[in-house]
């Protein structure tokens, strides 16, 4: 459920309207990513990858369709990636789902999570 703890976590990630975090990624008209992803933080790249996967998995984003897709999105790829994906979804599924349902772009969703500040470490 959208518990008080969730609200605290989400608020902590809210974008400051005056200090929005600029990212290098941009979505093309088909929702494809036009970006030099290696220049972005690992968390942001993870977010973009997962959100793009979810977008491709649903015909029309609704609470139900995105939630159903979210249970399958981390099933493919190497085990290390699956762990990263599951951890990300545990933290952000509600917010990612809400963003997709509202028609936010992958870039907007991931920026709003303040994940576009470069971070170190492998994906």
């Amino acid at each position: 459920r959208l518990s008080p703890e969730y609200y605290d976590l989400a608020r902590a990630h809210l974008r400051d309207e005056e200090k929005s975090c600029p990212c290098l990624a941009q979505e093309g008209p088909q929702g494809d990513l036009l970006t030099k992803t290696q220049e972005l933080g690992a968390d942001y790249r993870t977010c973009l990858t997962i959100v793009q996967k979810l977008k491709k998995m649903v015909d029309k984003p609704t609470q139900r369709s995105v939630s159903n897709a979210a249970t399958r999105v981390c099933r493919t790829g190497r085990s290390a990636w699956r762990d990263v994906c599951r951890n990300f979804m545990r933290a952000y599924q509600s917010r990612v789902t809400q963003g997709l349902v509202a028609g936010e772009t992958a870039q907007q969703i991931c920026e709003d999570l303040r994940l576009c500040i470069p971070s170190t470490g492998p994906l």
Epitope: Y7, E17, R64, S94
Partner: antibody, heavy 123, light 111 residues
Framework: EVQLQQSAAELARPGASVKMSCKAS????????MHWVKQRPGQGLEWIGF????????DYNQKFKDRTTLTADKSSSTAYIQLTSLTSEDSAVYYC????????????????WGQGTSVTVSS | DIVLTQSPASLAVSLGQRATISCRAS??????????MHWYQQKPGQPPKLLIY???NLESGVPARFSGSGSRTDFTLTIDPVEADDAATYYC?????????FGGGTKLEIK
């Protein structure tokens, strides 16, 4: 104070078009989707669809898709609905209502509504 | 489309008594632990007003006499005790699936 100010009542001929507006104030326009709801005299509520002012994404109820266009102007914080090829069935009150993109922006439902615009289609 | 059936269509309740309105969905409106069901109050000539969101959360400024409960397909709006100002039509609404849909409404009369 949050306000959604809708345009004045419209009287139109069958086959004509109308464009109604909903000017938002008192909140960050881009953090909310704008929804439109139809209410025929003495009847219940029907959801028409919504627009995300951030991304331009629109989601329509299939029932209204063919003759309805939703737009938004971020610079003036105004949302619009255009109805074409009007018939007597379009005579109704049309409400705009905001809905937060994310649940930490506010109650995750249509929490503020405009006063409604009455449309009368008559020859 | 998810059909929301409200019952009763109308009811008359004495001042100070409890009013209970039911909303049944044709399929579940639950996703990731939330029930995407909301309740609105509408008085003649006015726009709807949000009372309860996500099945059981009281909207800010709404009296605690109003409460919501339920999950999946069965939901209830309770007003206890009823006051004269509560005379209105009440609608449930779901946004778990497109198109978003409303119940047919329940008209509450105060005796």
């Amino acid at each position: 104070e949050v306000q959604l100010q809708q345009s004045a009542a419209e009287l139109a001929r069958p086959g004509a078009s109308v464009k109604m507006s909903c000017k938002a104030s008192g909140y960050t326009f881009s953090r909310y989707t704008m929804h439109w709801v139809k209410q025929r005299p003495g009847q219940g509520l029907e959801w028409i669809g919504f627009i995300n002012p951030n991304s331009g994404y629109t989601d329509y109820n299939q029932k209204f898709k063919d003759r309805t266009t939703l737009t938004a102007d971020k610079s003036s914080s105004t949302a619009y609905i255009q109805l074409t090829s009007l018939t007597s069935e379009d005579s109704a009150v049309y409400y705009c209502a905001r809905h937060p993109i994310y649940s930490d922006y506010g109650p995750y439902a249509m929490d503020y509504w405009g006063q409604g615009t009455s449309v009368t289609v008559s020859s | 489309d998810i059909v929301l059936t409200q019952s009763p269509a109308s009811l008359a309740v004495s001042l100070g008594q409890r009013a209970t309105i039911s909303c049944r969905a044709s399929e579940s409106v639950d996703s990731y632990g939330n029930s995407f069901m909301h309740w609105y109050q509408q008085k003649p000539g006015q726009p709807p007003k949000l009372l309860i969101y996500l099945a059981s959360n009281l909207e800010s400024g709404v009296p605690a006499r109003f409460s919501g409960s339920g999950s999946r397909t069965d939901f209830t709006l309770t007003i206890d005790p009823v006051e004269a100002d509560d005379a209105a039509t009440y609608y449930c609404q779901q946004n778990n699936e497109d198109p978003w849909t409303f119940g047919g409404g329940t008209k509450l009369e105060i005796k």
